[in-house]
Every structure is written in structure tokens, then in C-alpha cells.
């Protein structure tokens, strides 16, 4: 994917000291604060902007590949737009005073240039054939070779952002996505479960037939018991899900009504806050192109390359450069859908999704038949869901916990809150479940307020 727009930093990931809010040289020249610009733009029809010196004039924006050289002299007169110079670009219609600098691919991360920068599109960086991307952060990826699944078979083939998922042959176990011989399995390791028959057989060779058969009998006995248990669990889950569709799926009309007027905050800070649209102040810049400059005031989750979601080719600029602003955003509480919390002595809080208890409470209280829909809405791909189910074998609860942990890990901390989960549950018409989760975590008496942001 294309890197963000910091042009001058080369191979060693050296970072210019931007700690005092100094804006980068990557965007050649300064751009008016986007928040103010949006207010001005909203008065004019689409494709036009308000003249900075005369509020009554709407000037036509410049096409992508060009930048604003001079504002239009009067109504109905042309804006003076000039084409971007080599090494710079604008990816959408704009009224930027200067073009954005082209990104460079991170060679030390194994990245290669998929397509070079043009006046209307930033550099696109990616990985070589038979490699996949591992994201260290929202916009920094490294290329790794796909696993070949030696001594095993390919369960899920290698994808752009996902390594091959291997299933190992008998006598081998999966360690760091490679099939390793069971002879390398030590008692303390997880592999003992998978390599159990082999380990037992090794011990049994020196003794008579009973020592060989006994472990096998025990093993198959355990298998039968577990099958019986799974059968019972399956019936229980079906019963539980039916109950949930009745109890959990419908919330009281008053609550639904109360929510009508609630405006939910965007999932991430509004991109309009970025002082320099193409700049992503991550260490040594971003590998996902932040080339699509937008001055729209709405910020939909679809625009955000949420860590859990398969990233789209375009990422919004990171809102890191203005600490005061970022802090203000962070401290702004997200409205909680639970009215009972509003009525209680405590204001609604984000329960800590860093705490495993929170994630287990979600696992326990989301109807099993709606689980996949739930995690898909959180942004997990079917590929990841299958992989986590496979990795956790027969233990559905652990697979579901792993899915939430994956979402939690990949979602920037300020966004991975119970409010976000609540919003998803509300969209699924499962508000009752959210109440059950809150109840499971807080009990009947409200706990002291948890921190409203995950740190």
C-alpha cells in the first residue's frame, strides 16, 4: 500500500522531532485547519468552496492532480489551478495551496512499489509474490514469506494480509505456523494434547501389550465422553439461542424510543481534524496510502481501516499531530445506550475490554447463532473466523474469545470500548444482551466507574 506523505525520511526509521506540534515538511506548505474549512465549504454547493476573503463568493475546487494557485476573482469566474509537480500529487478535488509529497516504499520492511506516484495518485506499496503483509500498526506493514506447510496441508491459502493456515499430518504439531515433529514435543508444551498418542506409544514399547492398549482405551474413552459432552452442549446452545431470540433480541419500546435521538460519536477521530491531510505521523510514516484527501465532515466506520477489518487500499490520516485536540477527543465520552446507567449515580462508562472477564462476558451473552454476524460486524473476515475456529479445535468458547481478542488487539485503544460492542449489538437488535453483559460485569449494584478509555 502507498506510504503516507512524509517524503524525506529514508531507510533508518528516523523520526523528526514533531513533539511540539510542528507540522511536517512532507506537506509542502500549510493548509487551513480542516474543521474551519468544512464550515466554510458547507455553505457552497458540492465541488465549490467559499472564497477565503469573501464569504459571498463560491469558487470551483481544483481537479485531482492539480492544486490551488489563486482563488477565483469573482462569482462565475475560474479558479486558478496548476498541475502538481513531479514527486507530488493530489488524489481528489481540492483547494490545497500545495500538492502532497509522494510516499516512498519501506525497503527495510520488504515492501516493493506496486505502482509509482502520479500527479493524481500516491505511490502504492505492497509485497512480492508468495508473501503477505503483517501490520505492526494501522499503517505500517512488513512483508513475510507465506508458510509452505511442509509436513502438512494447506487449510487456508496465503492471502494479501494473512499467512497460510496449515493443518499438520499425524505425528506433527503446529508451532509458529510450521509443522514440527512430535519428537520435539516437550511435556510442558501445548503440543502434548496433539501428540498424546505418539508420546504414550513411545513409553509403551518397552512393556507388554497392556501398557500400549491402556492409554489407547483411555484416549478413546475420553473421546467418547467429549463427543457426548459436545452433543449436550450443542443442544444447550440451541436452547440458549432460542431463549435469547425471545428474551434478548427484543428490548423494551421505551428504551428503543430513548435511543432515537442519540447521536453516536464516530468510531475514530474525525479526519477533518488533521492539520495536514496526507500526513500520518507514525514513526517513519505509513505504508497505507493516505492519498484520498477528503474534507467531508462525516466519518463512517467504513472509511476507517479498523485493525480488525481487512484493510482497504486507503486509510484516513492519523490524528496524532495535535496533542491538545487528541486529548479533547479522548476525554469526550461516547453516549451509552443503557438508560438505566444514565439514571444511576454513575455516568455511563466504558468497561475495560483489556480485561478478559469483559470479553468472556460478551462471549457468554451473545446468542451463538448470531455470533458470526456479530464478529463480522466488528470487522473480522471469514478467513480469520475460520482460522480461529480451527486453531481452537473443539473449544467454541475459546475460539469466540480469540475472535474478540483479535478484534481488541487490532482496534486502536480509544475505539475498542464496550460502547462500540454495544453499538453493534444495538444494530443487531440485541440491546437486551448488552444489558446482560453489563449486569454480568457489574452485578446488581453498580461498580465504581471504570476508566472511560482503554490505555
Amino acid at each position: 500500500m502507498g506510504l503516507s506523505t512524509v517524503p524525506d525520511l529514508l531507510l533508518p526509521l528516523v523520526l523528526l522531532e514533531l513533539l511540539v506540534g510542528i507540522y511536517p515538511s512532507g506537506v509542502i506548505g500549510l493548509v487551513p485547519h480542516l474543521g474551519d474549512r468544512e464550515k466554510r465549504d458547507s455553505v457552497c454547493p458540492q465541488g465549490k468552496y467559499i472564497h477565503p476573503q469573501n464569504n459571498s463568493i463560491c469558487c470551483t475546487k481544483c481537479h485531482k492532480g492539480t492544486y490551488l494557485y489563486n482563488d477565483c476573482p469573482g462569482p462565475g469566474q475560474d479558479t486558478d489551478c496548476r498541475e502538481c509537480e513531479s514527486g507530488s500529487f493530489t488524489a481528489s478535488e481540492n483547494h490545497l495551496r500545495h500538492c502532497l509529497s509522494c510516499s516512498k516504499c519501506r525497503k527495510e520492511m520488504g515492501q516493493v512499489e506496486i505502482s509509482s506516484c502520479t500527479v493524481d495518485r500516491d505511490t502504492v506499496c505492497g509485497c512480492r509474490k508468495n508473501q503477505y503483509r503483517h501490520y505492526w500498526s494501522e499503517n505500517l506493514f512488513q512483508c513475510f514469506n507465506c508458510s509452505l506447510c511442509l509436513n502438512g496441508t494447506v487449510h487456508l491459502s496465503c492471502q494479501e494480509k494473512q499467512n497460510t493456515v496449515c493443518t499438520c499430518h499425524a505425528g506433527f504439531f503446529l508451532r509458529e505456523n510450521e509443522c514440527v515433529s512430535c519428537s520435539n514435543c516437550k511435556k510442558s508444551l501445548e503440543c502434548t494434547k496433539l501428540c498424546l498418542p505418539q508420546i504414550e506409544n513411545v513409553k509403551g514399547t518397552e512393556d507388554s501389550g497392556t501398557t500400549v492398549l491402556l492409554p489407547l482405551v483411555i484416549f478413546f474413552g475420553l473421546c467418547l465422553l467429549s463427543l457426548l459432552f459436545i452433543g449436550l452442549m450443542y443442544r444447550y446452545q440451541r436452547w440458549k439461542s432460542k431463549l435469547y431470540s425471545i428474551v434478548c433480541g427484543k428490548s423494551t419500546p421505551e428504551k428503543e424510543g430513548e435511543l432515537e435521538g442519540t447521536t453516536t460519536k464516530p468510531l475514530a477521530p474525525n479526519p477533518s481534524f488533521s492539520p495536514t491531510p496526507g500526513f500520518t505521523p507514525t514513526l517513519g510514516f505509513s505504508p497505507v496510502p493516505s492519498s484520498t484527501f477528503t474534507s467531508s465532515s462525516t466519518y463512517t466506520p467504513g472509511d476507517c481501516p479498523n485493525f480488525a477489518a481487512p484493510r482497504r487500499e486507503v486509510a484516513p490520516p492519523y490524528q496524532g499531530a495535535d496533542p491538545i485536540l487528541a486529548t479533547a477527543l479522548a476525554s469526550d465520552p461516547i453516549p451509552n445506550p443503557l438508560q438505566k446507567w444514565e439514571d444511576s449515580a454513575h455516568k455511563p462508562q466504558s468497561l475495560d475490554t483489556d480485561d478478559p472477564a469483559t470479553l468472556y462476558a460478551v462471549v457468554e451473552n451473545v446468542p451463538p447463532l448470531r455470533w458470526k454476524e456479530f464478529v463480522r460486524r466488528l470487522g473480522l473476515s471469514d478467513h480469520e473466523i475460520d482460522r480461529l475456529e480451527l486453531q481452537n479445535g473443539r473449544c467454541l468458547r475459546e475460539a469466540q474469545y480469540s475472535m474478540l481478542a483479535t478484534w481488541r488487539r487490532r482496534t486502536p485503544r480509544r475505539e475498542a470500548t464496550l460502547e462500540l460492542l454495544g453499538r453493534v449489538l444495538r444494530d443487531m437488535d440485541l440491546l437486551g444482551c448488552l444489558e446482560d453483559i453489563e449486569e454480568a460485569l457489574c452485578g446488581p449494584a453498580a461498580l465504581p466507574p471504570a476508566p472511560s478509555l482503554l490505555r
Epitope: L19, W136, S137, L140, F144, E176, P323
Partner: nanobody
Amino acid sequence: EVQLLESGGGLVQPGGSLRLSCAASGFTFATYSMGWVRQAPGKGLEWVSMIDPEGYHTYYADSVKGRFTISRDNSKNTLYLQMNSLRAEDTAVYYCAETNRPLTYKPWFDYWGQGTLVTVSS
């Protein structure tokens, strides 16, 4: 509250070795990619090395490849950096940090430890 406490720095001769440790608390350490960042005197910040939650993916800056080894012990909530064949240019303050943070985002510095100073000099 997130806390990261780095230790193990000190004065060492060129060619010598050091092992840095970072004790983490206040968050679920085992679910985060972590890394070591350094700041040489009068210079900017640089990612030295990174490791994913399972220890499967690792990254090393070109300047330290083959000399430094990153590892983690999730049961102890600790991140390590084994530094061998140290050079004068490795002199810096070393910090541990979560990789999903832009290092220019000032409030994030509130969650950093004091760092540990590594001085390589004869």
C-alpha cells in the same frame, strides 16, 4: 494505568553485550505487539526492533540485524532485547513501547517509562 519499566542499560565497551528488560503492567501485555525504540543524543526516535504477541513475527532495523535479538515472556509480562557486538552508534536511551502507537503522538509519552541509557564507549 499503563506502566512500562525499562532496565538493563549501562556503560559497555565496543563489542560487548547487554540485555534490556521491560516490565509491563496495566494492560493485557500478551495481546499487543511490542517493540524497542531508541533515541540517540540529539537525534530522532527510531524503531530498533518489534515482536508480535506470539513472538512469530519480528522486525529489526538494518543497523542492528544479526546483532540484536528481541524476545518476550508473556507469562512474566516482560519484553527483552539482547544486544551483542555493541557499537558506539548504539549509544542511546532505549524505550519499550506498543507498536500500534504513532511515536509523534505526544500524550503517548505519558505512558512511557524513563527509558534505559546504553552507552557504548571505550
